[in-house]
Each structure stands twice: as structure tokens, then as C-alpha cells.
């Protein structure tokens, strides 16, 4: 038994998987509707967020969330304590810092509570997931009369955990120069003309030592060097988002 | 339609080693959470190991160490290496396939599988 559903997007299967049963050897469970997937961020190691979307469901239903850690002394899943609504239906689970461990196999299971059946169970990786704080207190200083160095800091992690990807151009620059910089808050430019005014922001990751997320920060405040005389093309000089 | 088809099994004694493969035609795995599914007579149907298209993969307790997946989205295949074969070993291994928008998501529950192949035995004698 299958279900079929002519649809003309690029992404049909991903749009169809809301909509068709599985495809299963006879002999395995009748056909239930799929769950929407769960996708699980841990921000900052301050806290995580596990998500879904509930207007993926046919009629508005409370969903459950419930979560263990593969090796762990209670190996019973534990609900949600802290849910995150849509409107007024459940969409997500708040997970508090002391119930977060990066380095367990994370295993979450979401349940319809009229459908005991109906459920799907993940694991995750939460190292790979974490997305830090963006960058603060972005900081210019010369090294010499044409070096200057930018330094920032970050907040709860460990530097040594973070790769940072430095952006700066010019106001004669239609484009920005980028850089990745490992575990050091810090970066220096050998070369800068002090006719022309710079602009520098930096956003990081929890990659590669301790974990190998891809989601990078929020871009830091950008921060500003050089002369303010120069006459500057606006549209040039416009930060993209 | 994906259609999934293993091939691989077979009897082997204990001890050994089997490779089960399952290609895929109708579109391609690159998005797709994989696993690799068993099912003994009389038993319930459980993971073996299973995979999310960003490539993180788990196993069960019980293969841990013994067995490995890999993936060839170029050959739109997955394959489930088995060594160190063992008598309890022996079931029905299915693959299946779900189509997913995270790259971090590996279903370890079967019904979150829409797409499943026919099944390949394993018969592992001691």
C-alpha cells in the first residue's frame, strides 16, 4: 500500500511527507499519518529549543514531546516541562541548560496523544547543533601606524570551541573581504589606508573541536575605523543583512 | 515513487561478515534520512542503524561496533556492512527511506518511513 500525490515542486517529497503514508511490507502496521519532524537548536548551551510544525497537522492537535539521553542512569523519556505554543497549539519544547548534554545521544520522541500510535522518534547530535551568541564588544586597536587589530569576545563558550568568520570592507568596496579565524578572538589587518573608512562584524560557529555545527551566529554589531571625512556612496556603504 | 531493493543477504556462519546494499531508483537519497531495519520471526521489526542526510548516524546497542552504514548518493545506494556475525543476528533486514527538510533528522521509529524495500534474508548459523 502507497499514496500518491501529483505535485509540481522541486521540493514535492519534503511538501508530500506531510500527506502520505509509508510505503511498508504488508505485513508492518497500517498506515498512519507522518508527524511533522522535529528540529532541535541549542543556543549558546544556555538553553535548547526543539520545534515542529503544527500547522502541518490536518486538525489543530497537542503534540507531545517527550526526550532521554541514550546512556543515562533514568532511561525513561521524560515529557516536556516547558512547551512553546502557536497559536494555542503546542509547537515546541523548551530544554533548560541542566538538562542539556552535548555529548549524549539525544533521543526525542513526538507523540499524538489521541493517536498512542502515532509517533516518531529521533536522535540527535547536539554538538553539532549548538549556534553561539553573536560576537560582542567588537574592539579596534593599531598595532602600527597601518596594522589594525579587531578583537571581540563571546559569551558561555569555550573560545577554543569556536571558528569566527570575519567580514570588513571598505567604503570604496562593493563586496566584503571574509575570513575564517580558529578559536582566537582576534584578527589583524596588515594593510589599511586612512583615507578610507572601514566596516567589520564577525559571527561564529561551534565548529570544528567540540562539536561540527554549521549554523553560524548572528552577525556581531559592526564596528567602524577610519576617517570620517572621506565622502561616502551610500549605497555602497549599505550593511547586507 | 521511490522504490528501494536490497540484495546482500544470505546464509553465512558465525563470525563472518555480509554487506547488505539497497539502491534506490525514482530520486535521488541525498535528502533522505536511511535505515537499515530488522525483523526475526515472531519478533518486533527494530533499527539497526539508521541515518540523517547531514551524516550522522546511530546503531543499536546490540550492533554497535559490529556493523556500519555508509552511504553513495553519486550511486544513490546505502550499504550496511555486518561483521562479527552473530547467531541472533539472523532476520529479514529491510531498508527505508524518508524524505526530510533537516539535515540532522535520523528517525529511529519505522512508521516515520514512507518508503521501504522487500527485504533481504540474513541467516547466520552457528
Known amino acids: 500500500w502507497s499514496s500518491k500525490v501529483l505535485m509540481s515542486s522541486a521540493n514535492e517529497d519534503i511538501k508530500a511527507d506531510l500527506i502520505l503514508t509509508s510505503t511498508a511490507p504488508e505485513h508492518l502496521s497500517a498506515p498512519t499519518l507522518p508527524l511533522p519532524e522535529v528540529q532541535c537548536f541549542v543556543f549558546n548551551i544556555e538553553y535548547m529549543n526543539c520545534t515542529w510544525n503544527s500547522s502541518s497537522e490536518p486538525q489543530a492537535t497537542n503534540l507531545t514531546l517527550h526526550y532521554r539521553y541514550k546512556v543515562s542512569d533514568n532511561n525513561t523519556f521524560q515529557e516536556c516541562s516547558h512547551y512553546l505554543f502557536s497559536k494555542e497549539i503546542t509547537s515546541g519544547c523548551q530544554i533548560q541548560k541542566e538538562d542539556i548534554q552535548l555529548y549524549q545521544t539525544f533521543v526525542v520522541q513526538l507523540q499524538d496523544p489521541q493517536k498512542p500510535q502515532r509517533r516518531a522518534v529521533q536522535k540527535l547530535n547536539l554538538q553539532n547543533l549548538v549556534i553561539p551568541r553573536a560576537p560582542e564588544n567588537l574592539t579596534l586597536s593599531n598595532l602600527s601606524e597601518s596594522q589594525l587589530e579587531l578583537r571581540w569576545k563571546s559569551r558561555h563558550i569555550k573560545e577554543r570551541c569556536l571558528q569566527y568568520l570575519v567580514q570588513y570592507r571598505s567604503n570604496r568596496d562593493r563586496s566584503w573581504t571574509e575570513l575564517i579565524v580558529n578559536h582566537e578572538p582576534r584578527f589583524s589587518l596588515p594593510s589599511v589606508d586612512e583615507l578610507k573608512r572601514y566596516t567589520f562584524r564577525v559571527r561564529s560557529r561551534y565548529n570544528p573541536i567540540c562539536g561540527s555545527s554549521q549554523q553560524w551566529s548572528k552577525w556581531s554589531q559592526p564596528v567602524h575605523w577610519g576617517s570620517h571625512t572621506v565622502e561616502e556612496n551610500p549605497s555602497l556603504f549599505a550593511l547586507e543583512a | 515513487e521511490v522504490q528501494l531493493v536490497e540484495s546482500g543477504g544470505g546464509l553465512v556462519q558465525a563470525g563472518g561478515s555480509l554487506r547488505l546494499s539497497c539502491a534506490a531508483s525514482g530520486r535521488t537519497l541525498s535528502r533522505y534520512a536511511m535505515g537499515w531495519f530488522r525483523q526475526a520471526p515472531g519478533k518486533e521489526r527494530e533499527y539497526v542503524a539508521i541515518?540523517?542526510?547531514?551524516?550522522?548516524?546511530f546503531y543499536a546497542d546490540s550492533v554497535e561496533g559490529r556493523f556500519t552504514f555508509s552511504r553513495d548518493n553519486a550511486k544513490n545506494e546505502v550499504y550496511l556492512q555486518m561483521n562479527s556475525l552473530q547467531p541472533e543476528d539472523t532476520a529479514v533486514y529491510y531498508c527505508?527511506?524518508?524524505?526530510?527538510?533537516?539535515?540532522?533528522?535520523?528517525?529511529?521509529?519505522?512508521?516515520?518511513?514512507?518508503?521501504w524495500g522487500q527485504g533481504t534474508q540474513v541467516t547466520v548459523s552457528s
Open positions: 541515518d540523517s542526510w547531514g551524516g550522522d548516524t
Open positions: 527505508a527511506g524518508a524524505p526530510t527538510s533537516f539535515a540532522t533528522t535520523a528517525y529511529s521509529s519505522s512508521n516515520s518511513y514512507r518508503y
